[in-house]
């Protein structure tokens, strides 16, 4: 007998063909011999089956000797053997209906698990293979689990159900709720204004929740909450902010914070958390601030950086348009008795300058000027 696979909620068309290319009498029955539908002349008649309101045929095809059974809004329990009786012949078609659903919501937080559950008719033994948007393949039976969802897992998951060498394909759209970047680093000269941005990697109609920025300054023994805020329909309102530093926050998305001045005592790492309404867990983004200061005290020109710098970074002091006088993997470098001129303090990664601060050294009888 012929096997046809169907998807829960979809429509399936089971074919039945007579040798005569004309409208003749036919009946569709289920395995319990209960009539589903048939014809009486050019009229469609329906039997007492549970498919009554969901079963149909295509009258336009009857004249060609085709008598399909169309079942709409398929259910798992529609899986059965269907018999078409025409011209004293019986054509049997086995229909197997499968459903594939995500465990909970299709909007999941980064780091959470996605479970896909296959609904299948009794007696079937299907195999499932799913391909994530980033091309990762996972295989399983009745359930498939993916732990630690990442941003790249957002998009359409394509799952293929295989049974009796037949295939049926499901597409499930998954949205991973996350910030665009897990971590970011801001490099600033002392005194400059600092802008922190926390763009989200998803768009939803209404976004409601609450958030907080905790900050661990390099010089501090413990972290402290710098700001707490609410989010209502993409509108941001500040609940509480520390007095030092006095952060400002943008009223619209993306989440945006402004620190009026970069100072050594603020250099460090922050963690912005966002709790979304009706979601368990929180979104996180790490933000780092590195602050540079160039100073001249008597005969000593010093360049310092504070904050979470990588041991790969090089700190240099050089007289403008000249070779570096000192260039080391340190957070502080200095030059004794510097020549007069414009000195540059550079923080670089493999030659790429990340942060630069200039200081003018005047001849020894004057005081230094910071541009």
């Amino acid at each position: 007998k012929k096997v046809v696979l169907g998807k829960k909620g979809d429509t399936v068309e089971l074919t039945c063909t007579a040798s005569q290319k004309k409208s003749i009498q036919f009946h569709w029955k289920n395995s319990n011999q209960i009539k589903i539908l048939g014809n009486q002349g050019s009229f469609l008649t329906k039997g007492p089956s549970k498919l009554n309101d969901r079963a149909d045929s295509r009258r336009s095809l009857w004249d060609q000797g085709n008598f399909p059974l169309i079942i709409k809004n398929l259910k798992i329990e529609d899986s059965d053997t269907y018999i078409c009786e025409v011209e004293d012949q019986k054509e049997e078609v086995q229909l197997l209906v499968f459903g594939l659903t995500a465990n909970s919501d299709t909007h999941l937080l980064q780091g959470q698990s996605l479970t896909l559950t296959l609904e299948s008719p009794p007696g079937s033994s299907p195999s499932v293979q799913c391909r994530s948007p980033r091309g990762k393949n996972i295989q399983g039976g009745k359930t498939l689990s993916v732990s630690q969802l990442e941003l790249q897992d957002s998009g359409t998951w394509t799952c293929t159900v295989l049974q009796n060498q037949k295939k049926v394909e499901f597409k499930i759209d998954i949205v991973v709720l996350a910030f665009q970047k897990a971590s970011s680093i801001v490099y600033k000269k002392e005194g400059e204004q600092v802008e922190f941005s926390f763009p989200l990697a998803f768009t939803v109609e209404k976004l409601t929740g609450s958030g907080e920025l905790w900050w661990q300054a390099e010089r501090a023994s413990s972290s402290k909450s710098w700001i707490t805020f609410d989010l209502k329909n993409k509108e941001v309102s500040v609940k509480r902010v520390t007095q030092d530093p006095k952060l400002q926050m943008g009223k619209k998305l993306p989440l945006h914070l402004t620190l009026p001045q970069a100072l050594p005592q603020y250099a460090g790492s922050g963690n912005l958390t966002l709790a979304l309404e009706a979601k368990t867990g929180k979104l996180h983004q790490e933000v780092n601030l590195v602050v540079m200061r160039a100073t001249q005290l008597q005969k000593n020109l010093t360049c310092e950086v504070w904050g979470p710098t990588s041991p790969k970074l090089m700190l240099s002091l050089k007289l403008e348009n000249k070779e570096a006088k000192v260039s080391k993997r340190e957070k502080a470098v200095w030059v004794l008795n510097p020549e007069a001129g414009m000195w540059q303090c550079l923080l670089s990664d493999s030659g790429q300058v990340l942060l630069e601060s200039n200081i003018k050294v005047l001849p020894t009888w004057s005081t230094p000027v910071q541009p």
Epitope: P311, S316, R329, E330, A332, S350, G351, Q352
Partner: antibody, heavy 119, light 113 residues
């Protein structure tokens, strides 16, 4: 696999320039600094400078300042080292070498390009 | 510039014996900010490019046999091959990457006795 493939040997006259290429594959080109190191026949290793393929910034050893130019082409994942005003003492094998991800020691090296300067 | 000096210039060791190469820097290559020694060891065989053995003075690079070990801090460093194999015959270089220009030792030629 992760590799750096350099251009072939060159013979140059004194005063001329040479441009050596180094093509990266098997890793994200813009994530790693590329240094150039040379080795005169029977001698030790000498660092010439570094290029950051991400932004194209460079840092040269003072000895080569003004004579060396390092560039990169991100579309082909290739870095170039041009040395001008060649003299006989520039005869050497020139290597490109990749910095490690978490450290700056040179974890991947090109096969080397022999440059001979002779009149 | 930081000057790196290796000793000895050449060394002959019997197979299975321990080989020790020393490296001294003219200034400390220990970063007080990061508490790391910016020192690497390389092996170079004839006609081949150098191969990274050790970084951070004592961390073995991936795929390097555990008979190779590095030690030392500040200005004095040692590369030890615990049991010399025939394939270890090569020239060994130390290199500092603490301060630019990065500089190498003059090399130590290791042979089998």
């Amino acid at each position: 696999q992760v590799q750096l493939v350099q251009s072939g040997a060159e013979v140059k006259k004194p005063g001329a320039s040479v441009k050596v290429s180094c093509k990266a594959s098997g890793f994200t080109f813009t994530d790693y600094g590329i240094s150039w190191v040379r080795q005169a026949p029977g001698q030790g290793l000498e660092w010439m400078g570094i290029i950051n393929p991400s932004g194209g910034s460079t840092s040269y050893a003072q000895k080569f300042q003004g004579r060396v130019t390092m560039t990169r082409d991100t579309s082909t994942s290739t870095v170039y080292m041009e040395l001008s005003s060649l003299r006989s003492e520039d005869t050497a094998v020139y290597y490109c070498a990749r910095e490690g991800r978490s450290h700056d020691a040179f974890d991947i090296w090109g096969q080397g390009t022999m440059v001979t300067v002779s009149s | 510039d930081i000057v790196m000096t290796q000793s000895p210039d050449s060394l002959a060791v019997s197979l299975g014996e321990r080989a020790t190469i020393n490296c001294k820097s003219s200034q400390s290559v220990l970063s007080s900010s990061y508490n790391k020694n910016y020192l690497a060891w390389y092996q170079q065989k004839p006609g081949q490019p150098p191969k990274l053995l050790i970084y951070w003075a004592s961390t073995r690079a991936s795929g390097v046999p555990d008979r190779f070990s590095g030690s030392g801090s500040g200005t004095d460093f040692t590369l030890t091959i615990s049991s010399l194999q025939a394939e270890d015959v090569a020239v060994y270089y130390c290199q500092q990457y603490y301060s630019t220009p990065f500089t190498f030792g003059q090399g130590t030629k290791l042979e089998i006795k």
